[in-house]
Amino acid sequence: QPDAINAAVTCCYNFTNRKISVQRLASYRRITSSKCPKEAVIFKTIVAKEICADPKQKWVQDSMDHLDKQTQTPKT
C-alpha cells in the first residue's frame, strides 16, 4: 500500500510480489518524487485499490503500455 508522507507526496516502501492481470487495472501513476526512497508505479484497480509496483519489472512496464494505449484509443 502507498503511504502519504504529507498532504502532497505519496511514496511506496514495498512493492507487490505478484503480477496483476491488466483486466483488473484502471489507471496508474508514476512516483518519481525526490522525497521518496524508491521510484515506483501505483496502479489503481477497477475496485479503486492502490497497489505499489516496481517500474523495473517487465509486467509493470507492459501494464503501463497497455493502459497508455487504452487512454489513446477513444471508446466508441
Epitope: 508514476r30 518519481t32 525526490s34 522525497k35 512496464q61
Partner: antibody, heavy 121, light 111 residues
Amino acid sequence: QEQLVESGGDLVKPEGSLTLTCTASGFSFSTSYWMCWVRQAPGKGLELIACISSSIGVTYYASWAEGRFTISKTSSTTVTLQMTSLTVADTATYFCARTTDDNWNVGFNLWGPGTLVTVSS
Amino acid sequence: AYDMTQTPASVEVGVGGTVTIKCQASQSIGNRYLSWYQQKPGQPPKLLIYGTSTLASGVSSRFKGSGSGTQFTLTISGVESADSATYYCQQGATISYLDNAFGGGTEVVVK
C-alpha cells in the same frame, strides 16, 4: 534570485581525477528537488550523468557513469561530482541542473552556466 | 530502456514559418512525461515545455508540445530569428534509467 554555479573544471591528464562543485543560491535543499549533473561534449548533445535528491540523498546514475562518477550532497547548498579514471571522451562542459519541483517529470528549470573539463595528455 | 530519438537532426525555416520537431521514445512514456528545451551556443539549455504540453514560465505561446505514448512533437509557429537554436526532448517518466534521457537534438536554422 535562484542560481546555480559550477566550479572545478580544469585540464586533466587521462586516468586523472577531478571533483566538480555545484553551488546553489537563492534556495535551499531543504525544499526537495532532483539535482543532476549533465554534460555536453563539444558540438554534441546533452547527456545525463547522475542525479541526487536534495532532501533525502537518494542517487541515480547513467549506466556508463556507475562506479567512475559519484554524486554527493556536501552541504545544504552544494552538490559535487567526483570523477575518476578520466578519458579524452570525458572532455565536455559539465552543467548542474535542478528540477522545477520534487518530481522528475517537470523538467529542469534551473541550470548553471557550466564548467569546462578538458582531458588531454 | 527509455531511449529518446529526435528527428530531424537539422531543419531550415523562414521567418514567420512553422517548424515541427519529432521525438520518439523506445517504449511508452505515457502522455505527460516529456520536456522540451532550447539551447543557444555558449548557453545552458532553457526549459520550454514540461508534462508534454505545459509551457514553462515566461515561454511564448508560439511553442506547442503534443503527443503521447512513444511519439511526441514540438511545434514552433510564427518563427522568429531568435528561435535559431538547438532543441532537445527529455523523458520524465523514469529517473531509474538516465541513459539517453535526452534526444540527440534538432538544430533549427532561421533564414
